[in-house]
C-alpha cells in the first residue's frame, strides 16, 4: 500500500465560505485501503 | 464481502425527527471516514455529511443545508454510522446513502410530508 | 462552494462507439502533494453510485479498462473508448478536497 498522507486536517481552518483539507486523505481512509488483503478498488498509486 | 446496510428511513411530518443507522460489516471499520449522501427524486447526488476516525478526534463535516438540524455519528464497536435528523423540512425527502467514498449502500428513503 | 459543472447533461451513444464526459470545477482540485481530487462515478438504472476513477486517472478495480480519467486542474474528462450496453446511466464528476464536497449535475448516457 503507498504510504499515507500527511493527515493536516482543516476543521477549524476557515477560508471563504470554505474548509479545505489541503490534501485528498480519503483514499488512506477508504473502506478499500482497510481490507489488507484481496484486491482493492483503490490500488496504490504509482 | 463488504456490506453496508441503511435503515431508519420512513415518513414523517415536517418539523420531526428521524433516526438513520448504517450497519457495515466485512472490513475493519475503526479507521475508516464515512459519509452520507442524499439523492432528491429524479435529482443529483448531494454530500451532506461526513465523520472522521477517532484517530482525527471523530471530526464532523456538514453541508449548509442540514448543519444545525443534522447530526453524524458513528459507533466503532458496532461498526455502524448515524444520521440524526431534527427539524425536517420538505427538501429533506430524499434516498440517503452511506458510504465510504468506493462503496455504497443501497440507499434508505426518507419522505418529509404533512 | 467548488462548483463542478459537466457537459453534456445528456448523451446518446452507439455500442462500440468512443464517448467522452466534460466536468470542470471552479477551482483547482490539485493539491500540494501532486493529487488531484476528482472522482468519477456511474449510477445505472435503480443503483446506488459506483466508483469509476479516483484522483482523476486512477481507475478503480473492477472497471472495465476501457473507461479512463484525464485532465488538469480545473478541467478533466472521462473517456469511455468502446461504449458498451451497461454503460449507460447517470455520471457524476465530484470533488472531495473542498468542504462542501460538490458532486456535478450528472450527466445521462443513453443508447441511441
Known amino acids: 500500500l503507498a504510504d499515507p498522507l500527511d493527515h493536516r486536517d482543516a476543521g477549524d481552518l476557515w477560508f471563504p465560505g470554505e474548509s479545505e483539507s489541503f490534501e485528498d486523505a480519503h483514499v488512506e481512509h477508504s473502506i478499500s485501503r482497510s481490507l489488507l488483503e484481496g484486491e482493492i478498488p483503490f490500488p496504490p498509486t504509482s | 464481502e463488504v456490506q453496508l446496510v441503511e435503515s431508519g428511513g420512513g415518513l414523517v411530518q415536517p418539523g420531526g425527527s428521524l433516526k438513520l443507522s448504517c450497519a457495515t460489516s466485512?472490513?475493519?471499520?475503526?479507521?475508516?471516514?464515512m459519509h452520507w449522501v442524499r439523492q432528491a427524486s429524479g435529482k443529483g447526488l448531494e454530500w451532506i455529511a461526513h465523520?472522521?476516525?477517532?484517530?482525527?478526534?471523530?471530526?464532523?463535516y456538514y453541508a449548509e443545508s442540514v448543519k444545525g438540524r443534522f447530526t453524524i455519528s458513528r459507533d466503532d464497536s458496532k461498526t455502524t454510522i448515524y444520521l440524526q435528523m431534527n427539524s425536517l423540512k420538505t427538501e429533506d425527502t430524499a434516498v440517503y446513502y452511506c458510504?465510504?467514498?468506493?462503496?455504497w449502500g443501497q440507499g434508505t428513503t426518507v419522505t418529509v410530508s404533512s | 462552494d467548488v462548483v463542478m459543472t459537466q457537459s453534456p447533461l445528456s448523451l446518446p451513444v452507439t455500442p462500440g462507439e468512443p464517448a467522452s464526459i466534460s466536468c470542470r470545477s471552479s477551482?483547482?482540485?490539485?493539491?500540494?502533494?501532486?493529487?488531484?481530487?476528482l472522482y468519477w462515478y456511474l449510477q445505472k438504472p435503480g443503483q446506488s453510485p459506483q466508483l469509476l476513477i479516483y484522483?482523476?486517472?486512477n481507475l478503480a478495480s473492477g472497471v472495465p479498462d476501457r473507461f479512463s480519467g484525464s485532465g488538469s486542474g480545473t478541467d478533466f474528462t472521462l473517456k469511455i473508448s468502446r461504449v458498451e450496453a451497461e454503460d449507460v446511466g447517470v455520471y457524476y464528476c465530484?470533488?472531495?478536497?473542498?468542504?462542501?464536497?460538490?458532486f456535478g449535475q450528472g450527466t445521462k448516457v443513453e443508447i441511441k
Open positions: 465523520i472522521k476516525a477517532k484517530s482525527d478526534n471523530y471530526a464532523t
Open positions: 466485512g472490513f475493519p471499520f475503526s479507521n475508516v471516514w
Open positions: 484522483r482523476m486517472s
Open positions: 477551482r483547482s482540485l490539485l493539491t500540494s502533494k501532486g493529487i488531484t481530487s
Open positions: 458510504t465510504g467514498l468506493d462503496y
Open positions: 465530484a470533488q472531495f478536497l473542498v468542504y462542501p464536497y460538490t
